[in-house]
Amino acid sequence: LEVQVPEDPVVALVGTDATLCCSFSPEPGFSLAQLNLIWQLTDTKQLVHSFAEGQDQGSAYANRTALFPDLLAQGNASLRLQRVRVADEGSFTCFVSIRDFGSAAVSLQVAAPYSKPSMTLEPNKDLRPGDTVTITCSSYRGYPEAEVFWQDGQGVPLTGNVTTSQMANEQGLFDVHSVLRVVLGANGTYSCLVRNPVLQQDAHGSVTITGQPMTFPPEA
């Protein structure tokens, strides 16, 4: 029995519903009474959902899963996973047994977009060219971990003196804080780009600093 699932991971946004597709080719005369369908976590073999003895046996996974009962007889064994969480990410195995049997694993990739970065400056007043300032770019509640890039007003990447930290909250979503230490020119724009590598989503923040003009002591 050939069991088919998508080769590419299924990408689902946190809080939305995802469909893990799985199909098989029933032989002529196939009846649902013969079907034993198991969805389980690939690594731990924890039961997620099952269909046995001609009946949907329900969700064993936080009551957030459902089959498509009207489509089972046509060989559609797909699983609906509701209100996706970060903890759901991973591989799910679809196992189908009739007379023959087969299985295949589908990957679920969870994602959440990052918020528009907020920019803070320290110190934030009486700045002069030559001063060293700390610019912090903060973006919240994204998944998976972000990639952070800094550049100046001319689009030149700034890679030195950057410290980035990412902390997961209780839902597994990341808050990212990236700190750039820079010596001010006469004036300048500093941009931070927070990229979600799964969604290919870029969130931009920028700050423009106008330095006070340099004052020199009068010549003797």
């Epitope: 049997f101 087969g102 295949a104």
Partner: antibody
Framework: EVQQVESGGDLVKPGGSLKLSCAAS????????MSWVRQTPDKRLEWVAT????????YYPDSLKGRFTISRDNAKNTLYLQMRSLKSEDTAMYYC??????????WGQGTSVTVSS | DIQMTQSPASLSVSVGETVTITCRAS??????LAWYQQKQGKSPQLLVY???TLPEGVPSRFSGSGSGTQFSLKINSLQPEDFGRYYC??????????FGGGTNLEIK
Amino acid sequence: EVQQVESGGDLVKPGGSLKLSCAASGFTFSSYGMSWVRQTPDKRLEWVATINSGGSNTYYPDSLKGRFTISRDNAKNTLYLQMRSLKSEDTAMYYCARHDGGAMDYWGQGTSVTVSS
Amino acid sequence: DIQMTQSPASLSVSVGETVTITCRASESIYSYLAWYQQKQGKSPQLLVYNTKTLPEGVPSRFSGSGSGTQFSLKINSLQPEDFGRYYCQHHYGTPPWTFGGGTNLEIK
């Protein structure tokens, strides 16, 4: 008449390898999942490996994964079990069995494997 | 993995008597249970599958019952050819489809 004839069992030293065969006849071999099951000297039955009809899925107990490989040649109506790094606890009678779902509806007569120095 | 516990390990009975062998699964296997009979020097033979379905050729004195985690095989009016070993095996879900430890049924 459904028939499965196992062969390839032998006396082998620990660490050695052996390949068992099961020649099937009397049914459409390519339509059925097949398993190897062994019976230890104390008469316990132990599931060893399973393969589905097309050979796309194979299943093993964690304890044997990596050492044993099940395969099939549907053109030759033959099931195989490659056993490597054999241990004394692999000593058993090895049966091939045909599946109807998870239940095994026909078994061969078995082939004996003894692992001893 | 699902564990199968079979009892008794052995029993000695007379021809004509009725015997019951039980099998317990460590978690629900619904009705996906098979029983096998093995006579001395022979390979196992399927006796019952899906708890109570008898393959063609199996005498009606054999009957299976149960569901979930508790199952039994009953043999009415034992015949001389019924003596041997009996094994239960679950066939629910993905392998391993484990076997019980076996019951040796001998003539008293």
